[in-house]
Amino acid sequence: NADGLKEPLSFHVTWIASFYNHSWKQNLVSGWLSDLQTHTWDSNSSTIVFLCPWSRGNFSNEEWKELETLFRIRTIRSFEGIRRYAHELQFEYPFEIQVTGGCELHSGKVSGSFLQLAYQGSDFVSFQNNSWLPYPVAGNMAKHFCKVLNQNQHENDITHNLLSDTCPRFILGLLDAGKAHLQRQVKPEAWLSHGPSPGPGHLQLVCHVSGFYPKPVWVMWMRGEQEQQGTQRGDILPSADGTWYLRATLEVAAGEAADLSCRVKHSSLEGQDIVLYWEHHSSVG
């Protein structure tokens, strides 16, 4: 994928609202292009904060002002509504509501949209075809919540418009505006270290790979040309500069480490894999 992001691409907004008691609450709102955070919401000034130079996409200042206004109203209204209905919905303080909504692109075309709400970390309701539907496992509480949410069809029309029109328009403009950034290729650095000893006479070998972009990467401990199936890959973690970090570990008997190497494949290396030998300095093979 030329954009350096895995298909399907998505843009989504997440709203995490924590209700500590009847009067004390807080919220976090963020915008994401797949796993790259592009926007955040400043609750104090009720403004959208653009985290990348290209985060505005191709939307005009007027459109951004409209969106800010809409988010401001909806945040206030959502807080008011949840607080008002908390008792009859049997939401017990403290509780957390998580909402994620957005749209997906597949092969450069919009393939769908989504909007889901979770209560206390569990699926609760979702928005489909212009109305809210309960998750079957969520029970009567969710059914009642949908009844409340579906009282105002105008709000649902706005939601539908945001998901089916505004979001697809925005993600296409965002990808275009961020093309240079998203298509960049940053080579990884790799180094080896000892991990905590797994037991007497055994070693944990750690292969660190950092600073690479885009995210897809292949890291494996090898013995000659043989992949070591015991290789444990950690999660690919974000770095502050927008690149990624990964560690791969292998547990071996102390006497078997000698001819092991860590091999790293990444698109930026153009076929020139990084190979680090446990016994020697790093070299490029």
């Epitope: 409209e66 809409l70 212009n130 105002n152 069809q153 105008h154 539908h160 418009n161 945001l162 089916s164």
Partner: antibody, heavy 118, light 107 residues
């Protein structure tokens, strides 16, 4: 610069039909909901009908439901209002209006006068 | 349906005056309230949307406030071009509804 230009108004007899058009320019037409709002002579504003950006959703005031049909042609950047079974009380200036995220009518045309009289 | 009641229905004022028009909704509409200005023979013009957001290109002497059921449009210093009819409108629940209008004329 956003521009909305209505046409198609005129004098029509009760029970007759008329089709209003609104030519839009200066913005991405297909991205916005559009509405028709009318104003009877010397009276206030009354919303008539709305349509979503894609044209997939339409909405009507109770006073025109079943008689008026809103539509749009996004390839021509044009909004329409087909008015059938016209009554004297439909006499008004009809404005087309651009809808900003369903929040407000942020731009309006100059209006076209429809007179229903025998 | 939500009803909007504007007051006063008309007022006379002089250039430089501070003018306040109120709009009351029959039930809570959060901040989904807009203000329009209309001059004779012309189309309405959006001044304020979402209760307090100034539409681009509108002079800063216009301001809006309120939420729930009570809203206010204020013109801090009336100018000759401000003599017109002002309408509030709600977009919280369908259908969109307008107030009956407030005519501001010269004293």
């Amino acid at each position: 610069e956003v521009q909305l230009v209505e046409s198609g108004g005129g004098l029509v007899q009760p029970g007759g039909s008329l089709r209003l058009s609104c030519a839009a320019s200066g913005f991405t037409f297909s991205s916005y909901a559009m509405s028709w709002v009318r104003q009877a002579p010397g009276k206030g504003l009354e919303w008539v009908s709305a349509i979503s950006g894609s044209g997939g959703s339409t909405y009507y005031a109770d006073s025109v439901k079943g008689r008026f049909t809103i539509s749009r042609d996004n390839s021509k950047n044009t909004l329409y209002l087909q008015m059938n079974s016209l009554r004297a009380e439909d006499t008004a200036v009809y404005y087309c209006a651009k809808d900003a995220l369903w929040l407000a009518f942020d731009y309006w045309g100059q209006g076209t006068l429809v007179t229903v009289s025998s | 349906e939500i009803e909007l009641t504007q007051s006063p229905s008309s007022l006379s004022a002089s250039v430089g005056d501070r003018v306040t028009i109120t709009c009351r909704a029959s039930q809570s509409i959060s901040s989904y309230l807009n203000w329009y200005q209309q001059k004779p023979g012309k189309a309405p013009k959006l001044l304020i949307y979402a209760a307090s957001s100034l539409q681009s290109g509108v002079p800063s002497r216009f301001s809006g406030s309120g939420s729930g059921t009570d809203f206010t449009l204020t013109i801090s210093s009336l100018q000759p071009e401000d003599f017109a009819t002002y309408y509030c409108a709600q977009r919280s629940y369908p259908p969109p509804k307008f107030g009956q209008g407030t005519k501001v004329d010269i004293k």
